[in-house]
Amino acid sequence: GVFNYETETTSVIPAARLFKAFILDGDNLFPKVAPQAISSVENIEGNGGPGTIKKISFPEGLPFKYVKDRVDEVDHTNFKYNYAVIEGGPIGDTLEKISNEIKIVATPDGGSILKISNKYHTKGDHEVKAEQVKASKEMGETLLRAVESYLLAHSDAYNEQKLISEEDLGGEQKLISEEDLHHHHHH
């Protein structure tokens, strides 16, 4: 069966900035800002686009050791990100995969709303354990608030692209984003 759980949560961070940090650079940020939730993210294959496989490892004390995620869609224009949990964690005898959709929508107050859909694909007529749904939701909330705190404390990070002069780059003048300056990896 397919069990869909939808969540809406708000952030004070503008949509574009949050998408950059939380979605596009989450692999680098998460272990840094929320080491209690994620210990490492390893790129197994791909360059961040559809088909990319990542291994997310969790610290000791959490229910699962790791999960493998497959990137299905990255929409930079509409701030949409679709991915599936395909291995590890709760995936096993009763659960085939978890398809996740995240859309970040700008709000008039300058913040954003995250619309999250988690579809659990179970084998046969198995139900999804409540604790799996909770663990996933609470993990997402933990990561979001950690990234949000980081962005509030580092007002220059992940801002809109700015014109960097030739001297700064030691090369020709071009548009560059803040995370490129800090050698953050793009997906």
Epitope: V128, K129, E141
Partner: antibody, heavy 125, light 107 residues
Framework: QVQLQESGPGLVKPSQTLSLTCTVS??????????WSWIRQQPGKGLEWIGY???????YYNPTLESRVSISVDTFKNQFSLMLHSVTVADTAVYYC?????????????????WGQGTTVTVSS | DIQLTQSPPFLSASVGDRVTITCWAS??????LAWYQQNPGKSPKLLIY???TLHTGVPSRFSGSGSGTEFTLTISSLQPEDFATFYC?????????FGPGTKVDIK
């Protein structure tokens, strides 16, 4: 010891919004891993789980009510609230707030170990 | 959704009797089951969780057993304050549901 007390109007008109508050005393609503629930009991009927919320605001709802229900938390007042929109006479019930019993297994719920005394809400014009 | 059924719906018994109530789940819920007692005009009270663990302060005459789809609540020697309605509840998946209840009254 944690105690819960529901409050709110006892009479609501059809199509309006039912709004109830549960005040937590004897403990902090912000305790890690605590979840706070709403349950109702229609006259002469059994119990129905409405949904619950964590101290940080993540919510989980019964799909049968999800389109009409909203649960929120106010950590400063040590309260959590229920809003049920577009009520009908079928929403007439005793509404209980309750604390979820957590155990050794993280994120696993074991039952509702502390209950409020319940508040009767009648939907009538 | 997982459905729970209880048997019997009504039960007449005397003080001192041994009483057994059964709860069936529509699918395997492992041990994710709780039992409650509700006296008339009162809030439900948690008796048993995790199918067989007695909640703090609950008298030892109450016991729970079972796993998977069939569970029982047993009262070894019925006391006057035990005349009430008993509900089972699963906590396996969302939404959590309750059984329809078993009303125990005085014979």
């Amino acid at each position: 010891q944690v105690q819960l007390q529901e409050s709110g109007p006892g009479l609501v008109k059809p199509s309006q919004t039912l709004s109830l508050t549960c005040t937590v005393s004897g403990g902090s609503i912000s305790s890690a891993d605590h979840y706070w629930s709403w349950i109702r009991q229609q006259p002469g009927k059994g119990l129905e789980w409405i949904g619950y919320i964590s101290y940080r605001g993540t919510t989980y709802y019964n799909p049968t009510l999800e389109s009409r229900v909203s649960i929120s938390v106010d950590t400063f007042k040590n309260q959590f609230s229920l809003m049920l929109h577009s009520v009908t006479v079928a929403d007439t019930a005793v509404y209980y707030c309750a604390k979820v019993l957590q155990g050794l297994v993280r994120f696993r719920d074991y039952g509702f170990d502390v209950w409020g005394q319940g508040t009767t809400v009648t939907v009538s014009s | 959704d997982i459905q729970l059924t209880q048997s019997p719906p009504f039960l007449s018994a005397s003080v001192g009797d041994r009483v057994t109530i059964t709860c069936w789940a529509s699918q395997d819920i492992s041990s994710y089951l709780a039992w409650y007692q509700q006296n008339p005009g009162k809030s439900p009270k948690l008796l048993i969780y995790d199918a067989f663990t007695l909640h703090t302060g609950v008298p030892s005459r109450f016991s729970g057993s079972g796993s998977g789809t069939e569970f029982t609540l047993t009262i070894s020697s019925l006391q006057p304050e035990d005349f009430a309605t008993f509900y089972c509840q699963h906590l396996y998946s969302f939404p959590f549901t309750f059984g329809p209840g078993t009303k125990v009254d005085i014979k």
